[in-house]
């Protein structure tokens, strides 16, 4: 089981826009996969600030509900095993860690849940 | 009744090989990652490999990497540690154990690499 | 690699005690933390999983916390059968690994 995003850093400039893609590869399990998305700001590197869930509509943190909610940060599904994290218009509180995680409650599995990439924002 | 029993330990020199055993039995075995977890004498627990339901993915310890080949025949319901290049570090008792939280633990096998 | 760093490595304490030992990992695991009991000569026995999922059949005497980097078994009532050596794991990612143990001994 692994979780593949790009290869990172990403760089951006604020106010653009950010796409970053997720599939998670040689899963044991249901075709159809939730992913949560998270963030870790450099200030606070073990703290994940949840930014938005297939699964549960009431994931977000504070700091990223307005724009969920506003549409501006969303998760799109693409398939059972690969979403896209889409931030419409980037600020520079959202350079960080982006991880990608794939929860399962199912101790019959083994691998790897997520994975990391860091977006600089300039 | 869910068991694993394990067999295949005993007395090797350095550089010699040896194969382990797992047998499962009383679950579904081809459901369920394995793993083996070795402990050397008087000292903690540490993961050595393991190997997805279909067999498809297998994962090694660092230590190990290289040398040991962890593997499964679903339809013997039996797990399989292939040892080579072994070291007088690789002296334990080796368990194996199912799924990624290891809820069931064989009783174990002795490995001693000693000349 | 993920390091899991358990505390204390030993204690001392009496039936009855509550007791609590803690587990700190490198990063953070969300709750793919699971902890085990081991006996002398025996093969470890799984107590918590999910950080705090009681599997069955054990005494809820046992329970697990937390989420993220930190983790804490908690025996409520320490029983003449827990005397034992305690380890935390995780098994976010691979390679899974291990706590170096708690040994709780008789005061």
């Known amino acids: 089981r692994e979780v593949l995003v790009p290869e990172g850093p990403l760089y951006r400039v604020a106010g653009t826009a950010v796409s970053i893609s997720c599939n998670v590869t040689g899963y044991e399990g249901p075709a159809q996969q939730n992913f949560e998305w998270f963030l870790y700001r450099p200030e606070a590197p073990d703290t994940a600030l949840g930014i938005v869930s297939t699964k549960d509509t009431q994931f977000s943190y504070a700091v990223f509900k307005s724009r969920v909610v506003a549409g501006e940060v969303q998760v799109q599904r693409l398939q059972g095993d690969a979403v896209v994290l889409k931030i419409a218009r980037l600020q520079a509180q959202d350079a960080g860690i982006y991880e990608c995680h794939t929860p399962s409650t199912d101790t019959r599995y083994l691998g790897s849940y997520s994975g990391k990439v860091e977006l600089r924002v300039l | 009744e869910v068991q694993l029993l394990e067999s295949g330990g005993g007395l090797v020199q350095p550089g010699g090989s040896l194969r382990l055993s797992c047998a499962a039995s009383?679950?579904?075995?081809?459901?369920?990652?394995m793993s083996w977890v070795r402990q050397a004498p008087g000292k903690g627990l540490e993961w050595v490999s393991g190997i997805t339901g279909s067999g498809g993915s297998t994962y090694y310890a660092d230590s190990v990497k290289g040398r040991f080949t962890i593997s499964r025949d679903n339809s013997k319901n039996t797990l399989y540690l292939q040892m080579n290049s072994l070291r007088a570090e690789d002296t334990a008792i080796y368990y194996c154990a199912r799924g990624g939280a290891l809820d069931i633990w064989g009783q174990g096998t002795m490995v001693t690499v000693s000349s | 690699d993920i390091q899991m760093t358990q505390s204390p490595s030993s204690l001392s304490a009496s039936v009855g005690d509550r007791v609590t030992i803690t587990c700190r990992a490198s990063?953070?695991?969300?709750?793919?933390l699971a902890w085990y009991k081991q006996k002398p000569g025996q093969a470890p026995k799984l107590l918590i999983y999910s950080a705090s999922s009681l599997q069955s059949g054990v005494p809820s005497r046992f329970s697990g916390s937390g989420s993220g980097t930190d983790f804490t078994l908690t025996i409520s009532s320490l029983q003449p059968e827990d005397f034992a050596t305690y380890y935390c794991q995780q098994s976010y990612s691979t390679p899974l690994t291990f706590g170096g143990g708690t040994k709780v001994e008789i005061k």
């Open positions: 990063q953070v695991i969300h709750n793919y």
């Open positions: 009383g679950f579904t075995f081809s459901s369920y990652a």
